[in-house]
């Protein structure tokens, strides 16, 4: 019996087609992805093959203005239109709190939404009961297939699930649900979830009875043969894991942003064992036409977005200096504003010992592309912010050692004075440079804001301590020459859309007046510094 699994993950509000790098589509003849194009390909496969499942491994939420305006209603509407068979909850599905998941998505999806390791307690338990499930048995042709869901255990640090949801260890939570499916005589079981490729492989290895793992969160691109675009494969598709009980378990993921449609064909014997598996992600490029009826629907929904982008979010009473003359040479108040918004967006009081789990932000000055003039009545719109942050990136959470941060700050000024983009803007960090010293030895003071304290204050950076830092995904991926971040980071979780973070902060504050306040200091002459 043959099953075709079509899968997406980490689509992040890319409902419209995008450019090759998943940013805004500029030249339509070269654009990729989008739900209209995805639908064409899915329908083509459904017509050609008998047993097809379309699955999503989470993080449909968050990523473009579509989510900012429609808040998840767009996800339910277009996933219903594409007739997804099941979805696992990702961490970003909780970005607008539990209510922001229940109302627009859980109540409106015409397909099951899954997670076995999220348990509701207190008053939420009865409210959310039955709206998401630990597993689902799906009829496929004359057979049934079991799907068990899972979600990153880190979600409370990455999103806003509130205090009434408990995120359990994935493997511990999955095993009893798979066992339950086995007692129902369901012998073909797919684990569908959102915890990243490393956890996907562990699930394949450890959870008895799981035949296939379809994952997300780590934006992992797998491919067999010559890859069709710019993404470099992290391994073959499917990635085969040998389970502890000696079975070969295929593990798949399909990069992100709806650029590819994962396509896996599995052959099962009559006892539900996997005999063979093969496939590859399908690049959704312009050779695949956009479905006209879905496209028309997209255009109808688009109208509200254009109206939104010119409405006032809040006001500034000071000039927001995002000029390259400032932000690539010294502390600039636009950099301070953005970093403050980044920290504010990551306030998660999950532990009494810590006022917050993260206090530090770094931001490459080259990523700030425009100032905002306060003499336009002080008005700030989404359109204004899109000029400041035009790349459609995310502000991510990483964990790295103090020694890596020190290297990053040395890199920040290693060729100071040439208007290069790697000069870092900061939050929760005080840095002093001596630019008369040789490159690689210019950081003379680096103090960071404590987290495990009731009164936040600045302490010297410790080289072997592990710190959490919020930064643009561009930096986490080693952009602007920050190879040391990419090479040495201990953990990386993708975060919220950059513009969305800043716009939410401005709306929350109503009136802003960021200052240049001595976060970054530099001098060009020898000083005597006493290190304590």
């Amino acid at each position: 019996w043959e099953l075709t699994i079509l899968h997406t993950n980490d689509v992040h509000s890319r409902l419209e087609q995008t450019s090759e790098d998943s940013s805004k589509c500029v030249n339509a003849s070269r654009c990729m992805g989008g739900v209209a194009r995805l639908f064409t390909k899915v329908q083509q496969i459904r017509r050609a093959e008998p047993n097809v499942l379309l699955l999503d491994a989470g993080d449909q939420y968050q990523g473009t203005i579509w989510f900012t305006v429609y808040k998840g209603a767009e996800v339910a509407h277009f996933m219903n239109a594409l007739r997804y068979d099941a979805m696992a909850l990702g961490n970003h599905e909780f970005d607008n709190g539990v209510e922001g998941l229940i109302e627009p998505l859980l109540k409106e999806a015409k397909f099951p939404i899954l997670s076995a390791n999220i348990k509701a307690k207190g008053p939420l338990a009865s409210q959310i009961s039955g709206l998401y499930l630990p597993y689902k048995v799906l009829p496929v042709g004359d057979e049934v297939v079991g799907i068990v869901g899972y979600t990153s255990k880190e979600t409370p640090f990455l999103s806003n699930p509130g205090t009434n949801l408990v995120f359990e260890d994935e493997i511990t939570a999955l095993q009893p649900e798979v066992d339950k499916l086995k007692t129902l005589n369901v012998n073909k079981i797919i684990a569908l979830g959102h915890s990243g490729f490393e956890m996907d492989k562990l699930i394949a290895q450890k959870v008895r009875g799981v035949d296939v793992v379809v994952g997300g969160h780590s934006n992992t691109f797998l491919y067999t043969g010559n890859p069709p675009s710019k993404e470099v494969p992290a391994g073959k598709y499917p990635f085969i894991v040998t389970s502890d009980d000696g079975r070969k378990v295929p593990v798949v993921q399909a990069y992100a942003f709806g650029k590819y449609l994962g396509y896996l064909k599995i052959e099962f014997d009559e006892r539900g064992n996997v005999i063979s598996s093969h496939g590859n992600p399908i690049l959704l490029n312009s050779s695949i036409p956009e479905d006209p009826s879905i496209k028309a629907d997209i255009n109808k929904w688009r109208i509200k977005l254009d109206n939104y982008s010119t409405q006032e979010l809040g006001k500034t009473i000071v000039y927001l200096d995002g000029s390259s003359q400032s932000c690539r040479f010294r502390e600039c108040n636009m950099g301070n504003l953005i970093c403050d918004a980044m920290i504010n967006n990551n306030l998660r009081h999950t532990d009494e010992m810590f006022w917050n789990h993260v206090s530090m932000c770094i931001l490459n000055g080259g990523g700030i592309r425009s100032p905002i003039d306060e003499r336009n009545n002080g008005t700030i719109t989404w359109e204004n912010l899109a000029a400041v942050l035009p790349f459609g990136g995310t502000f991510d959470l990483v964990q790295l050692k103090g020694s890596t941060l020190k290297k990053a700050f040395e890199h920040s000024v290693h060729r100071y004075g040439q208007s290069t983009g790697e000069f870092l803007q900061v939050g929760g960090i005080h840095v002093v440079y001596d630019l008369s010293r040789k490159p690689g030895d210019r950081v003379v003071k680096l103090d960071v804001l404590c987290t495990k304290c009731r009164v936040p204050s600045y302490d010297p950076l410790k080289m072997d301590e592990v710190y959490k830092v919020i930064l643009p995904n561009f930096l986490a991926n080693g952009g602007d020459g920050f190879q040391m971040i990419k090479d040495e980071l201990l953990r990386h979780d993708s975060g919220d859309q950059d513009i969305n973070v800043v716009s939410t902060y401005i709306s929350k504050m109503k009136v802003i007046y960021p200052a240049v306040e001595g976060r970054i200091k530099a001098h060009h002459h020898h000083h005597h510094h006493h290190h304590h």
Partner: nanobody, 124 residues
Framework: ALQLVESGGGLVQPGGSLRLSCEVS????????IGWFRQAPGKEREGVSC????????YYADSVKGRFTISRDNAKNTVYLQMNSLKPEDTGVYYC?????????????????WGQGTEVTVSS
């Protein structure tokens, strides 16, 4: 919370008719496939009939084809099972059940939400 409550069961003579109702609360009916199942004493639970989300597709077990009709009133959040030409072998507890998905099925394993059941006895 999601709830399904069956009603309309009772004692009826062979050849008679009954109309079972299943009232759904806590969710919008048109997002769910609904199925009717029955369990005769000492027997496995069996699928009788099911209806897709919109009510556009309906399926019946061979044993009830031409005699039973499933229908739904999504506005009233109620599903009905009209049972005609009843036979003694139709006796059992009738359950209605629901699940979200695109493909209606008579396989009990795919249903996630169940009512408590209503008893039907066909006897002279």
């Amino acid at each position: 919370a999601l709830q399904l409550v069956e009603s309309g069961g009772g004692l009826v003579q062979p050849g008679g008719s009954l109309r079972l109702s299943c009232e759904v609360s806590g969710f919008t009916l048109d997002y769910y496939n609904i199925g009717w199942f029955r369990q005769a004493p000492g027997k496995e639970r069996e699928g009788v009939s099911c209806s897709s989300q919109s009510g556009g597709s309906t399926y019946y077990a061979d044993s009830v084809k031409g005699r039973f009709t499933i229908s739904r009133d999504n506005a009233k959040n109620t599903v009905y099972l009209q049972m005609n030409s009843l036979k003694p072998e139709d006796t059992g507890v009738y359950y209605c059940a629901a699940y979200r998905g695109w493909h209606p099925s008579l396989d009990a394993r795919v249903y996630d939400y169940w009512g408590q059941g209503t008893e039907v006895t066909v006897s002279s």
